[in-house]
């Protein structure tokens, strides 16, 4: 491993569509990919009138975006679904929103999904 | 590296079924996301279920609803697609293939296919 | 279900040329969109995951983009073993559902 990478090997996993797709609602998904590639965890969700709705979590596969990102944290301003990763385990556990604007002070939405959990 | 090799082509009668397997070679099968996909002669690809052997349960096409049963048996790295009440329009090459991840980022491992011919 | 779109069904390029092939979704899919090659006789290959993201092995003349609703593949530089059928594929909801497909022919 290169000195100061975190490596993901597993990150939370959730399903908003758990019944509709029979799998598990929420769990730990180990995460795989070639050994030059890096992997990530990442968090999806939607802002319906101030109400946070996870849509998926669970791992994401060598993406530039997401490197050496220790937060899940979103910077786009207002998205229709709300996108994050991170590298290390279980680090889309916390997520947040903290849009990056030109001209007023960025403001951070810190989200925490309450999913239930179950190892 | 994870493989997946398929059972041999079949024909089949109208009203009969067909099981079709999947061997994985590889690490860890009970952690995959497999996904059965098929392609009818010079048509498009069609999903048609998929199954996370470590959950056991698999979701289905509401197409093939109440037809087809996705099936895993960890012990011996194998996953099975049977698809009942054959008709002619069945007639076509079913694959198998892994998942990227539980969220299913991308195909990227796909077995050789499985040719089932439906006819009289 | 979600249906998915392709423009255009098929369309002719010389060797060197740069193509794009551009998918819709009917609904949004956020990023869950790949994108796949077929040739005759063969199973299909992933080239792209994550709307934009370049599968292990996949050349770098390969490219995705997009998000939502609206998608492109993007192709420089034609070599002539990119010939061939390509698909897009939303896996955001399901049934996962395939765009018809472009065929990408010499001219």
């Known amino acids: 491993a290169i000195l100061g990478r975190s490596e993901t090997q597993e990150c939370l996993f959730f399903n908003a569509n758990w019944e509709k797709d029979r799998t598990n609602q929420t769990g730990v998904e180990p995460c795989y990919g070639d050994k030059d590639k890096r992997r990530h965890c990442f968090a999806t969700w939607k802002n319906i009138s101030g109400s946070i709705e996870i849509v998926k979590q669970g791992c994401w596969l060598d993406d530039i975006n997401c490197y050496d990102r220790t937060d899940c944290v979103e910077k786009k301003d207002s998205p229709e679904v709300y996108f994050c990763c991170c590298e290390g385990n279980m680090c889309n556990e916390k997520f947040s929103y903290f849009p990056e604007m030109e001209v007023t002070q960025p403001t951070s939405n810190p989200v925490t999904p309450k999913p239930p959990y179950y190892n | 590296q994870v493989q997946l090799v398929q059972s041999g082509a079949e024909v089949k009668k109208p009203g009969s079924s067909v099981k079709v397997s999947c061997k994985a070679s590889?690490?860890?099968?009970?952690?995959?996301?497999i996904s059965w996909v098929r392609q009818a002669p010079g048509q498009g690809l069609e999903w048609m279920g998929g199954i996370i052997p470590i959950y056991g349960t698999a979701n289905y096409a509401q197409k093939f609803q109440g037809r087809v049963t996705i099936t895993a048996d960890e012990s011996t790295s194998t996953a099975y697609m049977e698809l009942s009440s054959l008709r002619s329009e069945d007639t076509a090459v079913y694959y198998c293939v892994k998942d990227l991840t539980w969220t299913n980022l991308g195909l990227d491992i796909w077995g050789q296919g499985t040719m089932v011919t439906v006819s009289s | 279900e979600i249906v998915m779109t392709q423009s255009p069904s098929s369309l002719s390029a010389s060797v060197g040329d740069t193509v794009t092939i551009t998918c819709r979704a009917s609904q949004g899919v956020s990023r869950w969109l790949a994108w796949y090659q077929q040739k005759p006789g063969k199973a299909p290959r992933l080239l792209i995951y994550g709307a934009g993201q370049l599968h292990s092995g996949v050349p770098s003349r390969f490219s995705g983009s997009g998000s939502g609703t609206h998608f492109t593949l993007t192709i420089s530089s034609l070599q002539p073993e990119d010939f061939a059928t390509y698909f897009c594929q939303q896996s955001y909801s399901t049934p996962f559902t395939f765009g018809p497909g472009t065929k990408l022919e010499i001219k």
């Open positions: 590889g690490p860890r099968f009970q952690d995959l996301s």
